[in-house]
């Protein structure tokens, strides 16, 4: 129903707290170098203006979009140029021209510090000081860094922080309270902003087609009772939503989202019978749980797939005359018949099958060039299986650290251009699939590792496109998003690249390094790592470990020593020398 | 729950025509197929004829091709066969089935379709 004043209609919805939070996201991530202050005194000004239109819709500017209310305030920034360089040039055009263009100016990478946390009790000071800017900071921060992180669910991390902080502040020992807990959210939250990103790059690279394809899987798979039509309408609201959220469109998301959450809990009977837990919540915290609801019990008589994809003689008549509704009916019975597979696999296996039909209902007799596909389905499945099974038990064998080591020699041999940041990033979150999947039962590992490394490889394309660097890389970016991890998993060692001549200072370690907490001292071993295979690609196993097991003894046994520098000064040259005679 | 409820059979000549017609009640209807099967004394049920839900597609049994047209009017949550040029062979109770929030129908197995009415008798007979 059209209303006369959009912000007035979201601001009454959503109500003035959520309301606040969204658009403190929504100009943290389109005008990303801003600090909070100057945000917040723009959320401000727009709240203000909310609340007129609430009083009288009729008032100046009211019936306004909020794409041009909210781009008026943003091109109304003092020196944007100055700080954003092109994306002022944004400000010259017309909605809905000029929100696309903010949309293009966001940056996945952008040039800001790593955020720190501070320290527990000067934490828990500013937060019990003014909970509202502190929680305000988080969204900020976090906005900011991940421009695509799905607002709504923003909202939600921010009041699982407010919980801790809340619940730790009140306690003896803050930081032992507060650590755990806060780094099981930022866990989460990382996880959250990588796959809502690919679900932006479905969008954007595909279309709402190729995203609702991926949400009729989901779906299927989580209400395998629920009918194809009650499927069909949960999927296109999804997709509508996630559009939305993709597209800037905050407000009308959380709101979209709020309602879709009231839909599915007044319609539990024709949807799931594992809904009830979540319904008794608050919104944000419905939407939620909603989201991450486990898969309903499958249907115990569904009869097999065969009677209606392959055995019935009107197959090739749906297709011709109904594609898309016949390959979606297709989909929906894979799909809610196989909680144990990946979204990626099912979308693969639904391809292969138009891909069948496509080619057999041109042919003189369809039904006998059709009637081996699902066994030809075989192969496919087979190949993801295999993945999981031999990265679990490597990351058995190795733990995470060394896993992450593996992953990050396997993927500098396939791709050795891309910059060594970027392939330590990745190497060390394609790592954790190990301990984010590898220890679950076995029927929830394949979706588990396989969706999980195509949302991480997802970042690894988008990084790469802005500066692209690889061809192999390249390629595989460019196809199909389901058939992006086999690209990758499929890539070999580099053969064209022509190794990294050795440089003494990358090898050059200072007294600095033992203090770093332990994060930061992985990282920089496996940035040495990834530097070592770039100046022997072909380096062996036992080569690498050699080499590596060296230089931990090496760091090791400086950190010990009572005169640090004049350890790493003498010795680290020793160390290059010995590393530079392994490899040769 | 589905309900379907068959009207409109009866005796009629050979060469003669009737409409049959079956009134649905259920949630998601108009996007469901709909199928005619009928059922022979001492035969299988069989498939006659079939329809799209949000789908403009029909599906027709051999024979009854160029002689039967099934249509359905949503608004009034109903689905119509109309018979033409019938044949003594075509004497069957006639059956309206579905299988809910299917778009298509994508197999003439009975087996398949949980829901059924309660069936009209035609008899074609001089």
């Known amino acids: 129903e059209a209303h006369k004043s959009e912000i007035a209609h979201r601001f009454k919805d959503l109500g003035e707290q959520h309301f606040k939070g969204l658009v403190l996201i929504a100009f943290s991530q389109y005008l990303q170098k801003c600090p909070y202050e100057e945000h917040i005194k723009l959320v401000q000004e727009v709240t203000d203006f909310a609340k007129t239109c609430v009083a009288d819709e009729n008032a100046e500017n009211c019936d306004k979009s909020i794409h041009t209310l909210f781009g008026d305030k943003l091109c109304a920034i003092p020196k944007l140029r100055d700080n954003y360089g092109e994306l002022a040039d944004c400000c010259a055009k017309q909605e809905p021209e000029r929100n696309e263009c903010f949309l293009q100016h966001k940056d996945d990478n952008p040039n800001l510090p790593p955020f720190q946390r501070p320290e527990a009790e000067a934490m828990c000071t500013s937060f019990q000081e003014n909970p509202t800017s502190f929680l305000g900071h988080y969204l900020h921060e976090v906005a900011r860094r991940h421009p695509y992180f799905y607002a709504p669910e923003l909202l939600y991390y921010a009041e699982k922080y407010n919980e801790v902080l809340t619940q730790c502040c009140t306690e003896s020992d803050k930081a032992a309270c507060l650590t755990p807990k806060l780094d099981a959210v930022k866990e989460k939250a990382l996880v959250a902003a990588v796959r809502q990103r690919m679900k932006c790059s479905s969008m954007q690279r595909f279309g709402e087609r190729a995203f609702k394809a991926w949400a009729v899987a989901r779906m299927s798979q989580r209400f395998p009772n629920a009918e194809f039509a009650e499927i069909t309408k949960l999927a296109t609201d999804v997709t509508k939503i996630n559009k939305e959220c993709c597209h800037g469109d905050l407000l009308e998301c959380a709101d979209d989202r709020a309602e879709l959450a009231k839909y599915m809990c007044e319609n539990q009977a024709t949807i799931s019978s594992k809904l009830q837990a979540c319904c008794d919540k608050p919104v944000l915290q419905k939407s939620q749980c909603l989201a991450e609801i486990e898969h309903d019990n499958i249907p115990a008589d569904l009869p097999s797939i065969a009677a209606d994809f392959v055995e019935d003689k009107e197959v090739c008549k749906n297709y011709a005359e109904a594609k898309d509704v016949f390959l979606g009916t297709f989909l929906y019975e894979y799909s809610r018949r196989h909680p144990d597979y990946s979204v990626s696999l099912l979308l693969r296996l639904a391809k292969k099958y138009e891909a069948t039909l496509e080619k057999c209902c041109a042919e003189g007799d369809p039904p006998a060039c059709y009637g081996t596909v699902l066994a030809e389905f075989q192969p496919l499945v087979e190949e993801p299986k295999n993945l999981v099974k031999t990265n679990c038990e490597l990351y058995e064998k190795l733990g995470e650290y060394g896993f992450q080591n593996a992953v990050l020699v396997r993927y500098t041999q396939k791709a050795p251009q891309v910059s060594t940041p970027t392939l330590v990033e990745a190497a060390r979150n394609l790592g954790r699939v190990g301990t984010k999947c590898c220890t679950l039962p076995e029927a929830q590992r394949l979706p588990c590792v396989e969706d999980y490394l195509s949302a991480i490889l997802n970042r690894l394309c988008v990084l790469h496109e802005k500066t692209p660097v690889s061809e192999k890389v390249t390629k595989c970016c460019s196809g199909s998003l389901v058939e992006r991890r086999p690209c990758f998993s499929a890539l070999t060692v580099d053969e064209t690249y022509v190794p990294k001549e050795f440089k003494a200072e990358t090898f050059t370690f200072h007294s600095d390094i033992c203090t770093l907490p332990d994060k930061e001292k992985q990282i920089k071993k496996q940035t040495a790592l990834a530097e070592l295979v770039k100046h022997k690609p072909k380096a062996t196993e036992d080569q690498l470990k050699t080499v590596m097991g060296d230089f931990a003894q090496f760091v090791d046994k400086c950190c010990k020593a009572a005169d640090k520098d004049n350890c790493f000064a003498t010795e680290g040259p020793n160390l290059v020398a010995r590393s530079k005679e392994a490899l040769a | 729950e589905v309900q379907l409820l068959e009207s409109g059979g009866g005796l009629v000549q050979p060469g003669g025509s009737l409409r049959l017609s079956c009134a649905a009640s259920?949630?998601?209807?108009?996007?469901?197929?709909v199928a005619w099967f009928r059922q022979a004394p001492g035969k299988e049920r069989e498939f006659v004829a079939g329809i799209g839900g949000g789908v403009d597609i029909t599906y027709y049994a051999d024979s009854v091709k160029g002689r039967f047209t099934i249509s359905r009017d949503n608004s009034k949550n109903t689905l119509y066969l109309q018979m033409n040029s019938l044949r003594p062979e075509d004497t069957a109770v006639y059956y309206c089935?579905?299988?809910?929030?299917?778009?298509?129908?994508?197999?003439?197995?009975?087996?398949?379709?949980?829901?059924w009415g309660q069936g009209t008798l035609v008899t074609v007979s001089s």
């Open positions: 259920y949630r998601y209807i108009d996007e469901t197929a």
């Open positions: 089935a579905a299988r809910p929030g299917r778009p298509l129908i994508t197999s003439k197995v009975a087996d398949l379709y949980p829901y």
